[in-house]
Amino acid sequence: EPPTACREKQYLINSQCCSLCQPGQKLVSDCTEFTETECLPCGESEFLDTWNRETHCHQHKYCDPNLGLRVQQKGTSETDTICTCEEGWHCTSEACESCVLHRSCSPGFGVKQIATGVSDTICEPCPVGFFSNVSSAFEKCHPWTSCETKDLVVQQAGTNKTDVVCGPQDRLR
């Protein structure tokens, strides 16, 4: 009685259960009554990551430096290459097919979370008592200078973009 289903790591062909090719190898010829499945290793820059009956291996992903990409981990015969972005850039999608420059936080805003290879900079408005006077992808909001601790008084109030200006206390004559 010919089988209708096969064991794990096997496939049904011509009413017969043949062994699948292991990861890193492709199918050359199906098994027969007298011969085993014939498999061949994937070539240079190729891979197959599952037990398979593929006749062609997949090409490793190319991390194109012109798109801001670099190789995070090189592919093997069983795994694809993993791309990520060069320093100062982040992926535009989960597949990381291209990169864009990290955004900077404008004056009045500080960095809440520094960008990574896969996520952009997260900015936040500087709350009362804090300021940022630069456009930066790294700088957080800085606290206003405390004039009191320096035995000075506030001569000019701070804003979300400027620090307070301290000055000497008026002496009573």
């Epitope: 240079e44 430096p65 670099r70 190789v71 995070q72 981990q73 090189k74 993993i82 990520t84």
Partner: antibody
């Protein structure tokens, strides 16, 4: 971003030695890290690399069994299993794949002598 | 893999041009995983060119890389006294175990 090797010293043949590469500002889960050596007055010799995500180490054919590369969160180690006088060299730690452009540490000198 | 670098030594006059060849016994990864490094005495190698022809950050445009597959060339034009040192090519392959360096080329500037 910087990397610095340490652990290089004078050892007697057969005494295992571990060199450490300490990184700063480099995410080791995002970069492959390799080791290269250079005997005095000679050329550069590739030892091996440890992959970023998988942490699997790959070695030059000649280096297989003679060296072990491993990593922690901010360090990458190179263990010289059983040094011989031929292993006298400056050992460099490198960020990235050699053939795809890499950043190098200043190196650490290992002298093997009885 | 084997990387054969030629010549092992070359001399040039200031302002002249130098060509260094690098031949691989098999194709490098993606046909372009070939880097060029400059090494001055007592210093670690410094990256000049990667992906066969991409100039590394901060490297003068006098340095130019070309080639693909198994044949590569580093060209230094308008040679300066500071260029007098040793240059290495390095190849990356499908298998990381095959990564290798060329034997080096010493550039002498007259």
């Amino acid at each position: 971003q910087s990397l610095e090797e340490s652990g290089g010293r004078l050892v007697t043949p057969g005494t295992p030695l571990t060199l450490t590469c300490t990184v700063s500002g480099i995410d080791l889960s995002s970069y492959a890290m390799g080791w290269v050596r250079q005997a005095p007055g000679k050329g550069l010799e590739y030892i091996g690399v440890i992959a970023s995500n998988s942490g699997i180490s790959y070695y030059a054919t000649w280096a297989e069994g003679r060296f072990t590369i491993s990593k922690a969160s901010t360090t990458v180690d190179l263990k010289i299993t059983s040094p011989t006088t031929e292993d006298t060299a400056t050992y460099f730690c490198v960020r990235g794949y050699i053939g795809d452009g890499a950043l190098w540490g200043p190196g650490t000198l290992v002298t093997v002598s009885s | 893999a084997v990387l054969t670098q030629t010549p092992s030594s070359v001399s040039a006059a200031v302002g002249g041009t130098v060509n260094i060849g690098c031949q691989s016994s098999k194709s490098v990864y993606y046909n372009n995983w070939l880097a060029w490094y400059q090494q001055k005495p007592g210093q670690p190698p410094k990256l000049l060119i990667y992906r066969a022809s991409t100039l590394a950050s901060g490297v003068p445009s006098r340095f130019k890389g070309s080639g693909s597959g198994t044949q590569f060339t580093l060209t230094i034009s308008d040679v300066q006294c500071a260029d007098a040192t040793t240059y290495y090519c390095a190849g990356g392959y499908s298998s990381d175990s095959d990564t290798t360096f060329g034997g080096g080329t010493e550039v002498v500037v007259k």
